[in-house]
Amino acid sequence: QFLKEGQLAAGTCEIVTLDRDSSQPRRTIARQTVKCSCFPGQIAGTTRARPACVDARIIKTKQWCDMLPCLEGEGCDLLINRSGWTCTQPGGRIKTTTVS
């Protein structure tokens, strides 16, 4: 079974668009659109800070840290109201991701 051009292998994702807004000091807002080809029972998400197919039940429960969204060595915490998550680097720098 060979993939057609533009067709993704099952269980993989690719970034389609990436917009960055660095107009505010010490703050970069990034919005990305991804295309995924996921196994049954999976949905597009984030693993190790990259687009990935994740267990669809994670999205339903909003247990975002169960996607393993942070890099290895970073700490993951849910935002209030489970509106997203933060990844805290060992040095203390925090990256916040909100789900819309």
């Epitope: 099952a10 269980g11 196994f39 693993t47 994670i58 993951c76």
Partner: antibody, heavy 113, light 107 residues
């Protein structure tokens, strides 16, 4: 980076037993942690998985027979009411994408009168 | 529930020869298949993930192929240290499932 299981021993049927998996060199909360067992001379059987939040999923045959739980530093497997069929080496193993990249050396559980 | 049929259950090979192990899935697993090597008294070690992606440190004589329901592990130029039991594992959905294993003896 490594895993080590402990708690395996000879138990009598029906006596609950808890096995513990300890990680070195990485954080358990950055991985999905699994338990897999292997009866003497037999193949590998996946028992179940625990997510960072504590959410668990089990193989159909393992539901009710095993309980997986975790702390910040360990992952436990409780064999609720062991029978002779549960005699096996029990491994903990980590995953991110569904395959097991690091395994512990295993701990032997023998269930006998 | 996924079932993985691994063949043959055992085989004997000569040093320098080629070994082929097959894994047949009861349903399409979308190339979500891994292969492990296990030696007596030791835990399994990951050889290949995603059907054909060789793990770091695994000799290039090991290779994997397949799609859909049919998958193959090939060891080309078999060495004495390749004597072991090999398992396939599917991970497209829960429960995660293993094949029954293939015991490889080297003559």
């Amino acid at each position: 980076q490594s895993l080590e299981e402990s708690g395996g021993r000879l138990v009598t049927p029906g006596t609950p037993l808890t096995l513990t998996c300890t990680a070195s060199g990485f954080s358990l909360s950055s991985y999905y942690m699994n338990w897999v067992r292997q009866a003497p001379g037999k193949g590998l059987e996946w028992i179940g998985i625990i997510y960072p939040s504590g959410t668990t999923y089990y193989a159909g045959w393992a539901k009710g027979r095993f309980t997986i739980s975790k702390t910040s530093t360990t992952v436990d497997l409780k064999i609720t009411s062991p029978t002779s069929e549960d005699t096996a080496t029990y491994f903990c193993a980590r995953t991110v994408s569904g395959y097991f990249d690091i395994w512990g050396p295993g701990t032997l559980v023998t269930v006998s009168l | 529930e996924l079932d993985l049929t691994q063949t043959p259950p055992s085989l004997s090979a000569s040093v320098g020869g080629t070994v082929t192990i097959n894994c047949l899935a009861s349903e399409d697993i979308y190339s979500a298949l891994a292969w492990y090597q296990q030696k007596p008294g030791k835990p399994p070690t990951l050889l290949i993930s995603g059907t054909s992606n060789l793990e770091s440190g695994v000799p290039p004589r090991f290779s994997g192929s397949g799609s859909g329901t049919d998958y193959t592990l090939t060891i080309g130029g078999v060495q004495a240290e390749d004597a072991a039991t090999y398992f396939c594992q599917g991970y497209s959905s829960y429960p995660l499932t293993f094949g029954a294993g293939t015991n490889v003896e080297i003559k």
